[in-house]
Each structure stands twice: as C-alpha cells, then as structure tokens.
C-alpha cells in the first residue's frame, strides 16, 4: 500500500492525461483525485501506464468505492479490469450488455480467466437467465462457453436463446449437458418444417431419446455418420436395422468404417445377423439365426 504523502506544488492533476505517466507511484496517489479518476476512466485506457501505476489507480478506486464500483466506472475500466480479483468483481452489479462486451474485449484472445468467469456469473445471475443476446455475446468470445456450464446452470437457458447457439458451440458438450439443451432446442425449433428442423436440431441430437430418433427416421433426413456417432448409445440400441437405414439414408454405408466403435458396435450386437445382412455392408457380430433375444432390462422392470 502506498504511503499518504502531500502532493508536490503544481502537480495536482486537473484531468487524466498522458502527463501522468511520468508521475511516480506516490505522486499518483497524492495528486490524482479518485472522483476525477472515476469520471474520466475512459481516458485511462489510452494512456500507457505501467502495471505499478495501474495498481495505484485501482487502489484509489477501491478507496472511493469500498462496496464495489458503479457500472459507469466498470464500463470504462479497460485494461484496469485485468487488475481486478474475483473478490472485487463479486461486489459489482453489472446489468448492461455493453459493459460486459467492453470487459470481454479486454480479455479477448486469452483463455477464460477466473475474473472473466466471475464477471459472467454475476451478469447472468443478475439477469436471472441466459438470454439470447447474452449467449450470442458469450459464445462469440468463448465458443466453448455453453459446454463449460453445469447442467444446473444450463437449465436457466430459455428455449428462445437456443437460436443463438452454433454447432461449434456444442463441440465439447457431454451427454448430461445435451440432455438439458436438446429439449429446449426441440421446443425452440418445433415450428420449422422437416428439413429445416433437422438442420437446426442436428447438433443437439446427442441428447435425443429413442422415440425422437424413430420419428426422425420417417422424415428422410439423411443423418451423417459424425452426428450418428454422437448419439446416446442407449437411444440408438432399440432402433431396428430398417430405422437406422432410413435415418442415415445414403450415409448408411459409413457404418462399415465405424463397426468397431460405439454406438455402432453395441447396436450391431443387438441386431439379428439376417437383418444386418440386408444392408449389404458386410457388418458382422449380429445375433445368429435361431437365437431368442431376451431384453433383461425390460424383464427386471416388469418383475
């Protein structure tokens, strides 16, 4: 902490300008009025202060606003934001999307820092839900943002926000996250016609139940193998050979290359070899002719 010393004669800052870069730390402390700094925060970013000088400016703002900075100051923090701790940010009440964008811009190109994570958390909690504009902004800066949220946090995403989600935003989502997002997507896109609906819902299908896959198989959707491989194994297993053939359309030939990988491998094991042979792909490992198939999981449920 900088010692309290009197400001030398003639050095009292009238405004925040480039002359301040020549001030020593103690002079900044003594000669820059915190209220002046707060009203002219937008100028700080244009001045090449050292990290030590920025520490002093932050200290002055902390003294002026011990309960947390007002949004008018937060919006213009610029590189001073990088000096903030998560504890500082938890005191803030950020409600403007413009403020959020301005601060994310400072951190652009870097991994999500604890400061940024705290800022986003405060912002989203303040809004009560992850609305479309916020999601648009966050995924633009951090494409993996959505998949970094827990299923509980994802539950606050309203279906209308799903329109902002791009396929690449879901690349790192696991099945538990897609379980939450898929029903929202299903609701959001339900007014689209068959082919348009499939284009939109495709990247969410890792959360789809069997019955929806059966329904899609009746729609001539021609699902690609990359999407098929991301489906829940337990949703794929009950599908018949005919349903998978309809679901994949011309892409059905790709099953051969994936026959050793889940969910294709597990699905093959559940099909009659006779049925698999109808595909003409040379898929092996199905149930031999004459064998009786018992669904033990269903048996348990009924007993």
């Amino acid at each position: 902490e900088v010692e309290k010393t009197a400001c030398p004669s003639g050095k009292k800052a009238r405004e925040i300008d480039e002359s301040l870069i020549f001030y020593k730390k103690w002079e900044l402390e003594a000669c820059v009025d915190a209220a002046l700094l707060a009203t002219q925060m937008d100028r700080v970013n244009a001045i090449p202060f050292t990290y030590e000088q920025l520490d002093v400016l932050k200290h002055k703002l902390d003294e002026l606003y011990p309960q947390g900075y007002p949004e008018s100051v937060i919006q213009h923090l610029g590189y001073l934001f990088l000096k903030m701790s998560p504890e500082d940010i938890r005191k803030w009440n950020v409600t403007s999307l413009e403020t959020l964008k301005a601060l994310l811009e400072v951190n652009k190109g870097h991994e999500m820092s604890p400061q940024v994570a705290t800022l986003i958390d405060r912002f989203v909690k303040g809004r009560g839900q992850l609305d479309k504009d916020t999601l648009d902004t966050l995924t633009a800066f951090y494409p993996g943002y959505l998949c970094s949220l827990s299923p509980e946090e994802l539950s606050s995403v309203p279906p209308s926000s799903i329109w902002a989600v791009r396929p690449q935003d879901l690349d790192t989502c696991d099945p538990r996250q897609l379980d939450v997002l898929y029903p929202k997507a299903r609701l959001a896109f339900q007014n689209m016609n068959g082919s348009e609906y499939f284009v939109k819902i495709q990247s969410f299908l890792g959360g789809a139940p069997t019955e929806d896959l059966k329904a899609l198989s009746q729609q001539n959707v021609s699902m690609d193998l990359a999407t098929f491989m991301k489906l829940r194994t337990d949703a794929v297993l009950p599908l018949t050979v005919a349903e998978v053939q309809k679901l994949l359309g011309p892409h059905v030939e790709g099953l051969k290359a994936e026959e050793r990988h889940r969910p294709v491998r597990d699905w093959i094991l559940r099909q009659r070899q006779d049925d698999l042979d109808t595909l003409g792909l040379g898929l092996q490992g199905g149930i031999p002719n004459g064998y009786l198939v018992l669904d033990l999981s269903m048996q348990e449920a009924l007993s």
Epitope: P183, K214, A215, P238
Partner: antibody, heavy 122, light 107 residues
Framework: QVQLQESGPGLVKPSETLSLTCTVS????????WSWVRQPPGKGLEWIGY???????NSNPSLKSRVIISVDTSKNQFSLKLSSVTAADTAVYYC????????????????WGRGTLVTVSS | EIVMTQSPATLSVSPGERATLSCRAS??????LAWYQQKPGQAPRLLIY???TRATGIPARFSGSGSGTEFTLTISSLQSEDFAVYYC?????????FGQGTRLEIK
C-alpha cells in the same frame, strides 16, 4: 401396451412433503420424457414438470422451488416430491408421457395414468 | 407464462348437433396447441395436436382449427359419449399451460 400407475399417500399434512411414484409397465422408461400434471378438485390442469431417463428435469417456475422430480430406470419408475405443501396443493396428480413417434417435436401428452387424489389436511 | 382462456365455460348442445369450443392464447402459440377430452373420474385423453391433427384412434367428427392466438375444436355430430370436459393446452413455450376447460353437457 404401455401403462402408467401413480402411487403414494392419499393424505399429507400441511408443511410436509408430498411424495408420489409413477410406475411405467409394458415398455421402457428410457425412450420418452415423463411429466407430472395435477388437477385441483373441480378445476383445470396444471403442468408440474418433466424428467428424462438420464435425470434431466424441467419444472413449472410457479412450483420450481418446491419440486423435485427423480427417476429410477432400474425400476422403470419416476417420482415427484413437493415440499411445504398447503391446502392449495390438494389435487388429483397424474403422471403422463410426453408424446412419441407421432411428431418429431411437441410437448403434449398421449398417455396418462389414472391419477391419484392427494389431500393436504391436518 | 402463456395464459389459455376457453369459452364458453359450459356449452349445452343436443345429441346429433354440432358443438364449437373456443380457446384463446394470451400470445401467439403458432400451431402448437393440443385438445384433450376428460370424463368424470378419468384421465384426460389426447384428441388433437398441432392445432388440427387428430391423434390415433380419434373419430373424424372431431376437428381442430386455428393458429396464432385463436383456436377452435369442432365436434360435427355429437354422440352421447362426447359429453365431457374439454381442455386446450399450448406447447409453444414452457411452462406448458392448459385452459380452464369447457364443460359440454346434454341440452
């Protein structure tokens, strides 16, 4: 064919937790979304919330703070817990299946249990 | 939430006649509307979904129409088994909401 059966206490004391279970027979719980809907005596229907077999849920904001919906796939059952009940929670509680196969999307119900009356009274 | 309002609350019609039930949404629900029939002591039964598509096993005398905020369920020639309470339900957004019901009674 698939059938649903609700079970649980018919009488619950005010401030206590109402607990109901829905047993799915004749088919697997894994393929659909499953909901709870209630109907106070002589009144209309109110959607409480749904659950997917993985455990993912969504519930009516008006009840969210009091509702827990869970699933036990090994027993082909899903359950409802409604805490801090009052007389206003007296209703017939239905479990229902969100529609499958007849549409790619759509949150409506093609299969219902017979319902169970739960009375909240001391 | 989307509020669904049904009218009339009670409708008295003679067997063999036509019955027209209305459902209004507080905001557009596109065509994401279902109709159910409920008889005393029974669970609701799905009649119509997508505002106009009959569910499996539902007789052709039941028809639905409308989109946006105004919907109609028409029963062309009432049979004795049709006297019941009818509910509309929107599924355009969560929470899913139902109308308060229209009681169809014998005149």
């Amino acid at each position: 064919q698939v059938q649903l059966q609700e079970s649980g206490p018919g009488l619950v004391k005010p401030s206590e937790t109402l607990s109901l279970t829905c047993t799915v027979s004749g088919g697997s719980i894994n393929n659909y979304y499953w909901s709870w809907v209630r109907q106070p005596p002589g009144k209309g229907l109110e959607w409480i919330g749904y659950i997917f077999y993985s455990g993912s849920t969504n519930s009516n904001p008006s009840l969210k703070s009091r509702v827990i919906i869970s699933v036990d796939t090994s027993k082909n059952q899903f359950s409802l817990k409604l805490s801090s009940v009052t007389a206003a929670d007296t209703a017939v509680y239905y479990c229902a299946r969100e529609v499958g196969r007849i549409a790619v999307a759509g949150w409506f119900f093609d299969l219902w249990g017979r319902g169970t009356l739960v009375t909240v009274s001391s | 939430e989307i509020v669904m309002t049904q009218s009339p609350a009670t409708l008295s019609v003679s067997p063999g006649e036509r019955a027209t039930l209305s459902c209004r949404a507080s905001q557009s629900v596109n065509s994401n509307l279902a109709w159910y029939q409920q008889k005393p002591g029974q669970a609701p039964r799905l009649l119509i979904y997508g505002a106009s598509t009959r569910a499996t096993g539902i007789p052709a005398r039941f028809s639905g129409s409308g989109s946006g905020t105004e919907f109609t369920l028409t029963i062309s020639s009432l049979q004795s088994e049709d006297f019941a309470v009818y509910y509309c339900q929107q599924y355009n957004n969560w929470p899913l909401t139902f109308g308060q019901g229209t009681r169809l009674e014998i005149k």
